[in-house]
């Protein structure tokens, strides 16, 4: 079952893959979606195959986020855009932190003050416009087993 208390990958050793997840954003109830063409957005459809994500621990507390169907990795670009790349680069790693409200945040390891975030409309939010305390940066990892 989809257990919201089942966190991400931060507590697991490097290289460890957990079951696929759906990342539910507190801001509007959108699931983070990675398209095969590299676009990133949010959708309120649990059945969308592109919301199934593989979180892999690179090191303790650092994860990459791969769209299972898209076979692409979430990346934060230097201008704050979110997109998904075919190959893992240094822009594809995020500090995963469990917040006190049981939601996770995903902060770019390269651009350390920028977070993965979704607007209330389901579009991604530019990293440069994100910050601590925003609802847009809060994600609840949920099981996405098929």
């Amino acid at each position: 079952p989809a257990l919201p208390e089942d966190g991400g990958s931060g507590a697991f050793p490097p290289g460890h893959f957990k079951d696929p997840k759906r990342l539910y954003c507190k801001n509007g109830g959108f699931f983070l979606r990675i398209h095969p063409d590299g676009r990133v957005d949010g959708v309120r459809e649990k059945s969308d195959p592109h919301i199934k994500l593989q979180l892999q621990a690179e090191e303790r507390g650092v994860v990459s986020i791969k769209g299972v169907c898209a076979n692409r990795y979430l990346a934060m670009k230097e201008d704050g855009r979110l997109l998904a790349s075919k190959c893992v680069t240094d822009e594809c790693f995020f500090f995963e932190r469990l917040e006190s409200n049981n939601y996770n945040t995903y902060r770019s390891r390269k651009y350390t003050s920028w977070y993965v975030a979704l607007k209330r409309t389901g579009q991604y939010k530019l990293g440069s416009k994100t910050g601590p305390g925003q609802k847009a940066i809060l994600f609840l990892p949920m099981s996405a087993k098929s």
Epitope: P1, P4, K26
Partner: antibody, heavy 121, light 107 residues
């Protein structure tokens, strides 16, 4: 405490339209979508669609497209459903229901008391 | 649309009995099934979400289980106040759909 107060019963003639309301209190209205559900007498439940009060965007069950129009008014924390070209098939109780959000995701955790619509000449 | 087939339609039980009802989805809906209770003359109330999680304040005699296409709802010890119709609902595929309901009657 979350409360959804729906408007009173309606007796309407075939071919007419009706607009019912659902006033929300006890939570931030724009944070959660409002679903609408139909229940014919002694029967099951049918999901009509939802309206997101944040941007007044609605999603519909295909079956109810052209029949139901969902809207909301942020200033009064009220959601509305208008039903058009009414027939006897539209006689039912209509519920508004707030989605749970968070760990409850899209489950409907608070319901209005229902608005009864009777279509009769 | 996903069809949720709920069985049985009626259950006649005595207080203290254990009752089980089932819901079968026409295709896999992951764990995204809720169970609602509707007492006579009242609105539905959420009891179980995401297949097996009890909603806040719901007594622990109510449990849900299942994954994929087959879901079960159990009341471990029926009480007189449990007289109601119980509905399952999937929110995995749009449009969200409900089962036809199981009417629980107490002898």
């Amino acid at each position: 405490e979350v409360h959804l107060q729906q408007s009173g019963p309606e007796l309407v003639k075939p071919g007419a339209s009706v607009k019912m309301s659902c006033k929300a209190s006890g939570y931030t209205f724009t944070n959660y979508v409002i679903n609408w559900v139909k229940q014919k007498p002694g029967q099951g439940l049918e999901w009509i669609g939802y309206n997101d009060p944040y941007n007044d965007v609605s999603k519909y069950n295909e079956k109810f497209k052209g029949k139901a129009t969902l809207t909301s008014d942020k200033s009064s924390s009220t959601a509305y459903m208008e039903l058009s070209s009414l027939t006897s098939e539209d006689s039912a109780v209509y519920y508004c229901a707030k989605e749970g959000g968070g760990k409850y995701v899209y489950a409907m955790d608070s319901w209005g008391q229902g608005t009864s619509v009777t279509v009769s000449s | 649309s996903i069809v949720m087939t709920q069985t049985p339609k009626f259950l006649l039980v005595s207080a203290g009995d254990r009752v089980t009802m089932t819901c079968k989805a026409s295709q896999s809906v992951s764990s995204d099934v809720g169970w609602y209770q509707q007492k006579p003359g009242q609105s539905p109330k959420l009891l179980i979400y995401s297949g097996s999680n009890r909603y806040s304040g719901v007594p622990d005699r109510f449990t849900g289980s299942g994954y994929g296409t087959d879901f079960t709802f159990t009341i471990s010890t029926v009480q007189a106040e449990d007289l109601a119709v119980y509905f399952c609902q999937q929110d995995y595929y749009s449009p969200w759909t409900f089962g036809g309901g199981t009417k629980l009657e107490i002898k």
